[in-house]
Structures are given as structure tokens and as C-alpha cells.
Amino acid sequence: SGTTNTVAAYNLTWKSTNFKTILEWEPKPVNQVYTVQISTKSGDWKSKCFYTTDTECDLTDEIVKDVKQTYLARVFSYPAGNVESTGSAGEPLYENSPEFTPYLETNLGQPTIQSFEQVGTKVNVTVEDERTLVRRNNTFLSLRDVFGKDLIYTLYYWKSSSSGKKTAKTNTNEFLIDVDKGENYCFSVQAVIPSRTVNRKSTDSPVECMGQEKGEFREI
């Protein structure tokens, strides 16, 4: 079946970073509107965008209830125009999304270096623990709260005067590295979930260099 003069949605795509999750689709509506529903494999369908002309729908509120569940969405198409002229239009067209498991698939957002502190020939580099929209007991969890030891950070660091990079890894949000006394270093970090098969790495953080405001230096 289906509805006269409507086009089924297509290219249903999940866009998700740090669990902020949007479903996008095509086409831009011409004389039609959409309703989006989301469900877990075992749950009821829940409407999130009802009779909308948008071609995206924010499903974050639903997926953060259990980020380890697998979700499916569907987009229904209806004819637009004057409401009273459409009446009962029969079964609407709909298209299913790909399945989406937030814990395994959400993109890791670009991390930020919160601070670095030099004490002699050691530098402590701290990565900001970004807040997500996942809640527990009415508080928002951080990325580390959600992923625990599944999440590691890779630090890239190099002398300001050269291009040779060194790396360090941590399963906390802090690095303690050895540096040469009297040398300035630059740092960049990347979030990684080694156990994943897709979306394993974030983009690199902005570079921060010693001798700039973020750092704190104590010569001992």
C-alpha cells in the first residue's frame, strides 16, 4: 500500500558524536511531511518527530536511556496540504534506518587538552573529561564515566624546535611524560576505543604548546 503523491524517505543516516544523536534523511519535503519513530529491538515504537517538515530528528533523549542497546528508527511520509482535505490516507509509506548501537558507533568528539604542568623534567598533561548527554541519577556522565577503561587517549608530543613526534597512551585522562630540561614541547591528544571495529578514533585535539597560557611551569 502507500499514500498518493508521497515519496518514501531514503538515505537514512545516523549522525552521532559523544552520544548526541541525530537521524537525517532525504528528500527535502515537497507537499509532504514526516513522522519519525524509534525503538529498541524488543521495545515499543516511540514517536520523536511527529508531522514535521524537517529532514532530521534529534533522537538523543531516547538513545541515552541505554547506550548499549541497538536502536532502529523509521521515517513515515504523509501528504501535506490542508489537513481536512487529506482525510484518512491509508497506510503511510515508511523507510527503516540502519540499526544503531550508540556505545559501539557514536563518534568520539574532538578532545581538548585541559592543562599541562611541568615539574622539572616531567610534564603532566590532563585531557578534559567531556560531559555527555547520558544521565545517571539525574547527573550527566562524562565520556570516561560511560566508556571506562574501554576509552584510552593517545598523546602526541614533540619539541617545538623539531618535527619528530613521540607518543604516550593512558586509560585515564592524565599523562606523565619525560621531557628534556629547557626545551619547549607541543602536545595533541586523540581519543581511541581500541576494541571497536568502526569509529575507533577521534580527530586530534587542537595543539597546545609550552610557553603559552595553558601550561604551568615549575623549575625544580
Epitope: 513522522t35 519513530q37 515499543d44 515504537w45 514517536s47 511527529f50 484518512s88 490516507a89 497506510e91
Partner: nanobody, 121 residues
Amino acid sequence: QVQLVESGGGLVQPGGSLRLSCAASGFTLDTYAIGWIRQAPGKEREGVSCISSTDGSTYYAASVKGRFTINRDNAKNTVYLQMNSLKPEDTAVYYCAAGPGTDCPLRFDYWGQGIQVTVSS
């Protein structure tokens, strides 16, 4: 005669409140999901709120969340939309519609004739 009839619309100042009613005659509402849909002049219709037939689960569009409340009284065969803190952009014809669905109707077996809501100072 089988129909849905909306009432409770009218002219209200910004910040004011209205309570819309959607009453069914000729059939019982309690087995249907009910949706409120509005259509502003020159715009496409927009889903505002829904309520399920079973567990009372509700849906609100982002533009009305926290301001509008939907509930149903099956004994009176009526669904209500309480609209608070109204804004000029809420001005539209409001329709109720009934159909099967877990919270919002997925097809529309019955439509009301619509009621005008105007928010203006």
C-alpha cells in the same frame, strides 16, 4: 454521526493560556492514539502533541515542550490540550486526529474540523 469536535480556541494575549478539547461522538476514543496537529497560514501542518491509547505515553514537539500538556478522559470520551505561556508563533488552526499507534497516530482514521487559536496583543 462519527466525528471529532474541537473546542476551546479563541484569541489570547501572549503569555496567556487556553485549553483545547477534542470530543468524539459515534465512536470511543479510548482505543485510539490521539494527535494534535496545527497549521499556521501559509505553512505546512506541524505535529504538536500526542497521547497513546494504552499507557498514556505522550509526545511533545520541541517548540511546545514544557508549555503544553496533553491528557485524556476516557469516561468523557475527550482529549485535552492545555496550552500555557502562549506565543504569537502558536497562532494556527489546531486539529485533533485519531488513529492507531503506540503514542502518535500512524494513520488517521478520524479528523476534527479544526479550531482557531490566535495569540496576539
